[in-house]
Interface confidence: medium
């Protein structure tokens, strides 16, 4: 009799789609790295399913993920960061599906923060600045940022600007006068590391002055 009988019908389980995706975050907590995986099908019954990573690890051959509701998560210093790791979905000792992944190619940076916009009356422009924790990191230092802004009334008309620095100048004449704007920023690795866009920073809202109206710092 199958050793997995108490875990439900394994034959039925093998018919399910166990496709999953993962992202890594390097030095997300001091020198600790994290790896987060989740099933692509939100309806997968995750009872008794475990994730395991093997290979390209320091001091150990394999590590098991912790389960946090519907995501699976590891926080560790033990990622070698060279070579591919084998990430498997398991029931007991049986692997249902595996992927070979280089953790340096699935990096998701932390979201930028401290986004602000200052209006310079004399220059007739807006200086956008933000911060990123990656400036202090050893590994994922070089990022491409995506600044997106829109007039608040234009639901889906976002204008995007890509930049590698954390400062951007928007010309007043390119914006509508006396309008409320929403702006936000996200980041993606842009050098040795590859991966995904970070979450968006919290939005910042600012109002453009009316024409010929002198104004200082934006709200």
């Amino acid at each position: 009799e199958s050793g997995y009988a108490q875990n439900g019908d394994l034959e039925d389980a093998e018919l399910d789609d166990y496709s999953f995706s993962c992202y890594s975050q390097l030095e997300v907590n001091g020198s600790q790295h994290s790896l987060t995986c989740a099933f692509e099908d939100p309806d997968v019954n995750t009872t008794n399913l475990e994730f395991e990573i093997c290979g390209a690890l320091v001091e150990v051959k394999c590590l098991n993920f912790r389960k946090l509701q519907e995501i699976y998560f590891i926080e560790t210093k033990k990622f070698l960061l060279i070579g591919k790791s084998n990430i498997c979905v398991k029931v007991g000792e049986k692997s249902l599906t595996c992927k070979k992944i280089d953790l340096t190619t699935i990096v998701k940076p932390e979201a930028p923060f401290d986004l602000s916009v200052i209006y310079r009356e004399g220059a007739n422009d807006f200086v956008v600045t933000f911060n990123t924790s990656h400036l202090q990191k050893k590994y994922v230092k070089v990022l491409m940022h995506d600044v997106a802004y829109r007039q608040e009334k234009d639901e889906n008309k976002w204008t995007h600007v890509n930049l590698s620095s954390t400062k951007l100048t928007l010309l007043q004449r390119k914006l509508q006068p006396a309008a409320m704007y929403e702006i936000k920023v996200r980041s993606i690795p842009d050098h040795y590391f590859k991966g995904f866009w970070s979450e968006w920073s919290p939005s910042y809202y600012f109002r453009t002055p009316e024409i010929n109206n002198s104004s200082g710092e934006m709200d």
């Epitope: 290979g55 690890l57 001091e59 070698l80 060279i82 070579g83 280089d102």
Partner: antibody, heavy 121, light 109 residues
Framework: EVQLVESGGGLVQPGRSLRLSCAAS????????MHWVRQAPGKGLEWVSG????????GYADSVKGRFTIFRDNAKNSLYLQMNSLRAEDTALYYC??????????????WGQGTTVTVSS | AIQLTQSPSSLSASVGDRVTITCRAS??????LAWYQQKPGKAPKLLIY???SLESGVPSRFSGSGSGTDFTLTISSLQPEDFATYYC???????????FGQGTRLEIK
């Protein structure tokens, strides 16, 4: 059978160039980082250069930096070392080696038999 | 870069002897160390990885120990085929970098 076969060595004058090749077989080449290690006559092992599976991670020993270039062609299961501005001190037996990071640490578990480079006028 | 210093540089021993070779790192490397054996005219052969894990097919008379900066390779009972040169090796993953010790030549007394 896992195998690495180096070629391209020979006698070359100082300042000239040479390209070494390493043909890999018996394993999934594009899953593994690869290295060049050399050994001068009667001397110890010296790591020369390494390249990650996808060519994005590359390293060189200080003694060859700026003169040697490592590259790979995963479609051809081949590793290369382009050696420019050769010096007498580059004379050595050059080994191609495969990493096996699944061991937990970065170790070289398969080595070729080497190809000899002699730099002399 | 981290330096690895092996000692002794050479030693003479007899069949059946217990032999210890040490490798000292210039800074702590956890257990990121491997040992290789090289016989004249041959390519190096992996013996030990993770400081103490025995490579498949390597006789159990070989063992490794240590962590941090001090590591040892021990051959519990020397066999005639063990006379060779032994190297320790360390790696750094970012940037990619490998360092070898200068080698220890083990000769028949």
């Amino acid at each position: 059978e896992v195998q690495l076969v180096e070629s391209g060595g020979g006698l070359v004058q100082p300042g000239r160039s040479l390209r070494l090749s390493c043909a890999a077989s018996g394993f999934t080449f594009d899953d593994h980082a690869m290295h060049w290690v050399r050994q001068a006559p009667g001397k110890g092992l010296e790591w020369v250069s390494g390249i990650s599976w996808n060519s994005r991670g590359i390293g060189y020993a200080d003694s060859v930096k700026g003169r040697f270039t490592i590259f790979r062609d995963n479609a051809k299961n081949s590793l290369y070392l382009q050696m420019n501005s050769l010096r007498a001190e580059d004379t050595a037996l050059y080994y191609c080696a495969k990493d096996e990071y699944s061991r937990g640490y970065y170790v070289l578990d398969v080595w070729g038999q080497g190809t000899t480079v002699t730099v002399s006028s | 870069a981290i330096q690895l210093t092996q000692s002794p540089s050479s030693l003479s021993a007899s069949v059946g002897d217990r032999v210890t070779i040490t490798c000292r790192a210039s800074q702590a490397i956890s257990s990121a160390l491997a040992w290789y054996q090289q016989k004249p005219g041959k390519a190096p052969k992996l013996l030990i990885y993770d400081a103490s894990s025995l490579e498949s097919g390597v006789p159990s008379r070989f063992s490794g120990s240590g962590s941090g900066t001090d590591f040892t390779l021990t051959i519990s009972s020397l066999q005639p085929e063990d006379f060779a040169t032994y190297y320790c090796q360390q790696f750094n993953s970012y940037p990619l970098w490998i360092t070898f010790g200068q080698g220890t030549r083990l000769e028949i007394k």
